[in-house]
Amino acid sequence: APVRSLNCTLRDSQQKSLVMSGPYELKALHLQGQDMEQQVVFSMSFVQGEESNDKIPVALGLKEKNLYLSCVLKDDKPTLQLESVDPKNYPKKKMEKRFVFNKIEINNKLEFESAQFPNWYISTSQAENMPVFLGGTKGGQDITDFTMQFVSS
């Protein structure tokens, strides 16, 4: 059966939106008015992985782009990147682990934990206009909580 996907946007708990800031980079900043259409639309696919009531494995692709968020080691540090894939083969139910995030719902907020690197989360900075990154701390300065907005296909 084909993998189930939905289209959505994400905002961090400070209401910063995510935009493409480079061919393989996202950043977070406050948008308003017409600028809101600049935010990236994700195609969130529900993939194979360890699942529980509040933890669901997903892959985060960019809608209509052959790009997925992935987690890799760079200079011995878990790092978030946008990775180009062959559209003929993606999305698929059994995604490679670097593409998988555990979507964790707590108090109507979402966290995205790397399946490859447990306790590392998709994060944004408090500061405006900074790259989205993989952070190894929760509850500190950096933001790991998001809200999801559904987008019609």
Partner: antibody, heavy 116, light 110 residues
């Protein structure tokens, strides 16, 4: 809006910088593209300066052009122009609508003539 | 990669007639296609984006369709003011690309 400037007659090999001045939107949010059009020919994409500051180039343009920006301007440097670079150069804002890149609005263009 | 082939290169149409311009992408671009109109000596103007959405202020005589690799721009009830060159543009990828535009179609109105 966007408006180009700096186009002029130059001799081959003389570096030239074109400037795109933007107003009404932020270069922290929007990517800007450069496109050129040789006399009587079609539109040819040169490259982008992304909102994060990195540049992407058409495969043929790498090494020949450099795109950079300040808070309100985007520069296109033609490092060593040849007669083949004679064209009208346009800049445009890149709108990302559901991740799809669309060019709007466009500037009126600035003419570069390369001749000895 | 992502080469855009536009046909025909030129077409002559009578006032009130209909013209169809085709654009083919060498790889799947979903709905990531825009169409622009350029009149001689002027800047290009966005007509249609996301394959079929009309840009603000563009008359409904213009319509776009298609997805994947095959796309069409149709202009009906042609007016003299529609004489221009029309370009398609893929907006999906900017990596290792020669040109994001098709070669253009000149529409001559008789």
């Amino acid at each position: 809006s966007v408006e180009e400037s700096g186009g002029r007659l130059v001799t081959p090999g003389t570096p030239l910088i074109l400037t795109c001045t933007v107003s009404g939107f932020s270069l922290d949010v929007y990517t800007v593209t450069w496109v050129r059009q040789a006399p009587g020919k079609g539109l040819e994409w040169i490259g982008y300066i992304w909102s994060g500051g990195s540049a992407s180039y058409a495969s043929w343009a790498k090494g020949r052009f450099t795109i950079s920006k300040t808070s309100t301007t985007v520069d296109l440097k033609i490092s060593s122009p040849t007669t083949e670079d004679t064209a009208t150069y346009f800049c445009a804002r890149v709108k990302m609508i559901s991740n799809i890149e669309t060019f709007d609005p466009w500037g009126p263009g600035t003419l570069v003539t390369v001749s000895s | 990669a992502y080469d855009m082939t536009q046909t025909p290169a030129s077409v002559e149409v009578v006032v009130g007639g209909t013209v169809t311009i085709k654009c083919q992408a060498s790889e799947r671009i979903y709905s990531g296609l825009a169409w622009y109109q350029q009149k001689p000596g002027q800047r290009p103007k966005l007509l249609i984006y996301r394959a079929s959405t009309l840009a603000s202020g563009v008359p409904s005589r213009f319509s776009g369709s298609g997805s994947g690799t095959e796309f069409t721009l149709t202009i009906s009830d042609l007016e003299c003011a529609d004489a221009a060159t029309y370009y398609c543009h893929q907006g999906v990828s900017s990596s290792d690309i020669d040109n994001v535009f098709g070669g253009g179609t000149e529409v001559v109105v008789k």
